[in-house]
Interface confidence: medium
């Protein structure tokens, strides 16, 4: 057993028919030593008396908050939460894998530039009783500080029959430098407590490996005289890392008929600028990627051709 | 990216264009080591991050873009001092700071160079002979640092008596090309940056 | 109350090879099932387990060349890719490795040879 | 993964002698920490689980002990059914892995 937060408690617990259970021992914070009785969530039944109740926690029923009272006043709560571990295996049910870009990828990281700014985000089926609560560092063994926000509802799918729903967290290295050359991972720890489970999932990684720049910004086309060409130009997203001519981008221009079967037409540069052949109903689109360090493209940025 | 690439100019500074060839080449090893030594920890995640020019350059703290040196987090340690006679230079844009960072890359190139080789030459005797370093990626080390031309003196390579144990050198050679595909990038911006100064 | 584990058998290197572990008068649905291998004169080495909802969990060797899976409530494969000599072992089924019941199967024999 | 060091790798005792085998994780793995005994032909048999938690039929003379990340089985009045391998089994949450394994022979 050991304290989550002030007054909540895990208990880990081998999840087998019949397995033995922890025996847990629960005292009342007070002063007080007689006249104290204990009951759990909602009940009036009385489970014991005395500073201290024994219970052996076994399943879900054995967990929930547990109240120590005295003459009819609330002295104290203990909330005890479950980490089911079958078979040496901690339970992942609260998320969903995501399967990219590998099995048991629970969370899932971007970051727009290298100022130490990244968003994590992940799924789940359940739409109560959920809480989520970030913690993130620089190495584990002398970890610097990362801040995170609180989780947040993000969005909403309906898959098939089942509705998912993705949370997200937005965290920020307290000391970054862009230039800097990683050589601690991030380390992200997630704790998630559905009804009274309890979870934990981390992930790691170097920022570098998670960037995924924004889409390139005023992407316009310029129709060249007396030819089918057009040049066409962009601009570096404005979330990008400065200087631009340190932290590169280089570009894919794509022209793709209205057609998902048409042959796409694919150039890339380093520059903000490309002249390509504008069919009658294509759009052209462009997209970026860090120019030394092959991470994620963006999305692609499009504009018809008409 | 196999694919049609428009690309530009190397322009006025000699140095981009090694420094483009260097990155290639490190990755296209990197890329190959990753492949032959499948059963190796030879990721990004299973290796332990090392880098030998720790304490001895400051690479990225004196090739730090100006726009940056308002950064506090950025400006660890900017006390060492090296040679200042690259010929990467165009002599009117000489300034103590990219005489001091070019001199730095020049510095990690040798040291990486020496490593490079003296691992070479355990993984030679390697009867597996399972992988060796690319000589192409050695070249391209070689001529980055001819168009650098400082003048240093010569580090002799180290030899070693004992027997080469080949799993740790094959582990050793996939940490130090990760470390030098990291460092191959920052030479590559700090390029990108000096040409377009 | 036993498992019985079956399919082993020689095998040429490259090869690839199925095992099932089935289970008679007990039940798999509330346990965990996990694999075990051991080579001859060798020790033990915990492969990789496949809990009650079906979530997988592998070694960090085996992962990639070693597929375990549940087709039945009584039935737990192990399908091999890639065979070498060095998978030559007798493969282990058992039930719930750390809890008291824990029932083993009398392991099944593979031998990876040219 | 975590990672079971096993100590000695053999050792043998007279009948009525006390054996202690070592086991050390390579992280903290609390109480996940299963003791098998090994007998040539046959299938490893639990002895001890959660660390300390004696199974069913095992006889009291076997004891599982834990400090920090060091796990030790204790075996007093060492008796002749008792020659065999011995493994501990060390589970991190996400992987187990087994000790080397110790043989155990009788004089």
């Known amino acids: 057993i050991w304290e989550l937060k002030k007054d909540v408690y895990v208990v880990e617990l081998d999840w087998y028919p019949d397995a033995p259970g922890e025996m847990v021992v629960l005292t009342c914070d007070t002063p007080e030593e007689d006249g104290i009785t204990w009951t759990l969530d909602q009940s009036s039944e009385v489970l014991g008396s005395g500073k201290t109740l024994t219970i052996q926690v076994k399943e879900f029923g054995d967990a929930g908050q547990y109240t120590c009272h005295k003459g009819g006043e609330v002295l104290s709560h203990s909330l005890l939460l479950l980490h089911k571990k079958e078979d040496g295996i901690w339970s992942t049910d609260i998320l969903k894998d995501q399967k990219e870009p590998k099995n048991k990828t629970f969370l899932r990281c971007e970051a727009k530039n290298y100022s130490g700014r990244f968003t994590c985000w992940w799924l789940t089926t359940i739409s109560t009783d959920l809480t989520f609560s970030v913690k993130s560092s620089r190495g584990s063994s002398d970890p610097q500080g990362v801040t995170c926000g609180a989780a947040t509802l993000s969005a909403e799918r309906v898959r098939g029959d089942n509705k998912e729903y993705e949370y997200s967290v937005e965290c920020q290295e307290d000391s970054a430098c862009p230039a800097a050359e990683e050589s601690l991972p991030i380390e992200v720890m997630v704790d998630a407590v559905h009804k009274l489970k309890y979870e934990n999932y981390t992930s790691s990684f170097f920022i570098r490996d998670i960037i995924k720049p924004d889409p390139p910004k005023n992407l316009q086309l310029k129709p060249l005289k007396n030819s089918r060409q057009v040049e066409v130009s962009w601009e570096y997203p404005d979330t990008w890392s400065t200087p631009h001519s340190y932290f590169s981008l280089t570009f894919c221009v794509q022209v793709q008929g209205k057609s998902k079967r048409e042959k796409k037409d694919r150039v890339f540069t380093d520059k903000t600028s490309a002249t390509v052949i504008c069919r009658k109903n294509a759009s052209i689109s462009v997209r970026a990627q860090d120019r030394y360090y092959s991470s994620s493209w963006s999305e692609w940025a499009s504009v018809p051709c008409s | 990216r196999n694919l049609p690439v428009a690309t530009p100019d190397p322009g006025m500074f000699p140095c981009l264009h090694h420094s483009q060839n260097l990155l290639r080449a490190v990755s296209n090893m990197l890329q190959k080591a990753r492949q032959t030594l499948e059963f190796y920890p030879c990721t990004s995640e299973e290796i332990d991050h090392e880098d030998i020019t720790k304490d001895k350059t400051s690479t990225v703290e004196a090739c730090l873009p100006l726009e940056l040196t308002k950064n506090e987090s950025c400006l660890n340690s900017r006390e060492t001092s090296f040679i200042t006679n690259g010929s990467c230079l165009a002599s009117r844009k000489t300034s103590f700071m990219m005489a001091l960072c070019l001199s730095s890359i020049y510095e990690d190139l040798k040291m990486y160079q020496v490593e490079f080789k003296t691992m070479n030459a355990k993984l030679l005797m390697d009867p597996k002979r399972q992988i060796f370093l690319d000589q192409n990626m050695l070249a391209v080390i070689d001529e980055l640092m001819q168009a650098l031309n400082f003048n240093s003196e010569t580090v002799p390579q180290k030899s070693s008596l004992e027997e080469p144990d080949f799993y740790k050198t094959k582990i050793k050679l996939c940490i130090l090309l990760h470390a030098f595909r990291i460092r191959a990038v920052t030479i590559d911006r700090v390029m990108s940056y000096l040409n377009a100064s | 109350q036993e498992l019985k584990e079956s399919g082993g058998r020689l095998v040429t290197p490259g090869g690839s090879l199925t095992l099932s572990c089935t289970a008679s008068g007990l039940t798999l649905g509330s346990y965990s099932m996990t694999w075990v291998r051991q080579a001859p004169g060798k020790g033990l080495e915990w492969m990789g387990v496949i809990g009650v909802g079906g979530t997988l969990n592998y070694a960090s060797w085996a992962q990639g060349r070693f597929t375990i899976s549940k087709p039945s409530s009584t039935t737990v494969d192990l399908k091999m890719t890639s065979l070498t000599t060095e998978d030559t072992a007798t493969y282990f089924c058992?039930?719930?490795?750390?809890?008291?019941?824990?029932?083993w199967g009398p392991g099944t024999l593979v031998t990876v040879s040219s | 993964d975590v990672v079971m060091t096993q100590t000695p790798s053999s050792t043998s005792a007279a009948v009525g002698g006390t054996v202690t085998i070592k086991c050390q994780a390579s992280?903290?793995?609390?109480?996940?920490l299963a003791w098998y005994q090994q007998k040539p032909g046959q299938p490893p048999k639990p002895l001890i689980v959660r660390a300390s938690i004696l199974t069913s039929g095992v006889p009291s003379r076997f004891k599982g002990s834990r400090s920090g990340t060091e796990y030790t089985l204790t075996i007093s009045g060492v008796q002749r059914e008792d020659a065999a391998t011995y493994y501990c089994?060390?589970?991190?949450?996400?992987?187990?892995?087994f000790g080397g394994g110790t043989e155990l022979e009788i004089l």
């Open positions: 089994l060390g589970g991190d949450g996400h992987v187990s892995n």
């Open positions: 058992a039930r719930g490795t750390y809890s008291g019941d824990s029932i």
């Open positions: 992280q903290s793995i609390s109480s996940w």
